[in-house]
Amino acid sequence: SAGAGSHCQKTSLRVNFEDIGWDSWIIAPKEYEAYECKGGCFFPLADDVTPTKHAIVQTLVHLKFPTKVGKACCVPTKLSPISVLYKDDMGVPTLKYHYEGMSVAECGCR
Amino acid sequence: SAGAGSHCQKTSLRVNFEDIGWDSWIIAPKEYEAYECKGGCFFPLADDVTPTKHAIVQTLVHLKFPTKVGKACCVPTKLSPISVLYKDDMGVPTLKYHYEGMSVAECGCR
């Protein structure tokens, strides 16, 4: 699995809704693949981490002043929806095909 | 300044183009305010860090399994341009009013 020593990448993160207390309103699925962005944003930032100009600048400043400025951070840059069966305001089981922003599609350095 | 103990916020980061080796092609300014996003993404994530659903989920999973899953990360969520006088391909000083993505406008938890 991607640790601090490896470069920024998407790794598996299975989330159980009961663990986070969302089982009170999400009926199904019981768990889903959320993914997580893990790893470091090391110099030089590769194209696959789609760095912004600011991330490139911050990486260069960190290189010169590592104690003063932090590295860019490996975060989700694109998210995907999942389908959920949830309880609506009245508690009635209701299907949302596209519950946006729940799963990582892409990671990058920001 | 905002450290790991404080919550995610925008802090000052003056960048000198000579320090990062960009003075070879950026003529002016000599330095600029890039800002940096610093601080932690602690539970509960406040509205001002505009968390995505994934960031909220990851924060809740981190709360339950702190050694297995990291916190969401404080990163730039909106960037601003700066104006630069640079040398074009032929070395001619050229003004770019909007050199995009160089300065942090907003920080958030992602």
Epitope: I27, A28, P29, S83, L85, D88, D89, M90, G91, V92, P93, T94, L95, K96, Y97 | -
Partner: antibody, heavy 126, light 110 residues
Framework: QVQLVQSGAEVKKPGSSVKVSCKAS????????IHWVRQAPGQGLEWMGG????????YYAQKFQGRVTITADESTSTAYMELSSLRSEDTAVYYC???????????????????WGQGTLVTVSS | QSVLTQPPSVSGAPGQRVTISCSGS????????VYWYQQLPGTAPKLLIY???NRPSGVPDRFSGSKSGTSASLAITGLQAEDEADYYC???????????FGGGTKLTVL
């Protein structure tokens, strides 16, 4: 236009099981919940349970818990209701009814049972 | 015994107005929408009113629904012979997590 067509009448012995089918045509099966409602002779309507085929999630009225199983086959757009340990009081007409579950539909209509199947008479007799 | 209470029967002459009441509690009618179904002799029920007071297409405007507190009612004006049927009210019960029906009201057109 959505239509629900149910299987034919059944005569069963006490203690046995019955499985009634409900085939949907028209519309998108994954947008539905299929519910089962029964009506004993000369009596009112009684909700038994429902299933959301998209996730295969079923929920039941307490009264029938453990005795009823509702399933669905998305490939054939068919829902099934199986009732076990039959007794004479289970003699009734069993109806399937659609409820739209997708939240892209206004909540007022989303909670309605519409349309209904033609009904299946199940007679439990020794 | 049904969770929602309806009168067993009502009657009226052709052209008259009749109302059918449906009484519930705070966990069903009091907090959720009410639905009315018409069941003609020997046929399956048919949706008549949805969301308290909405008519599906094809249902004459002689039929109207209303709700106040924990009670609802169905009004039929200009009574016709073909209105002779059983009428059922229905709502979701938030507390019990079930769909509940009234016992049904038999309408006789004199």
């Amino acid at each position: 236009q959505v239509q629900l067509v149910q299987s034919g009448a059944e005569v069963k012995k006490p203690g046995s099981s019955v499985k009634v089918s409900c085939k949907a045509s028209g519309g998108t099966f994954s947008d539905y919940a299929i519910h089962w409602v029964r009506q004993a002779p000369g009596q009112g309507l009684e909700w038994m349970g429902g299933i959301i085929p998209f996730f295969g999630t079923a929920y039941y009225a307490q009264k029938f818990q453990g005795r009823v199983t509702i399933t669905a086959d998305e490939s054939t757009s068919t829902a099934y209701m199986e009732l076990s340990s039959l007794r004479s009081e289970d003699t009734a007409v069993y109806y399937c009814a659609r409820r739209i579950v997708s939240d892209s539909v206004a909540v007022q209509y989303r909670h309605a049972f519409d349309p209904w199947g033609q009904g299946t008479l199940v007679t439990v007799s020794s | 015994q049904s969770v929602l209470t309806q009168p067993p029967s009502v009657s009226g002459a052709p052209g008259q107005r009749v109302t059918i009441s449906c009484s519930g509690s705070s966990s069903n009618i009091g907090s959720n929408y009410v639905y009315w179904y018409q069941q003609l002799p020997g046929t399956a029920p048919k949706l008549l009113i949805y969301g308290n007071n909405n008519r599906p297409s094809g249902v004459p405007d002689r039929f109207s629904g209303s709700k106040s507190g924990t009670s609802a009612s169905l009004a039929i004006t200009g009574l016709q012979a073909e209105d002779e049927a059983d009428y059922y009210c229905n709502a979701w019960d938030t507390k019990a997590y079930v769909w509940v029906f009234g016992g049904g009201t038999k309408l006789t057109v004199l």
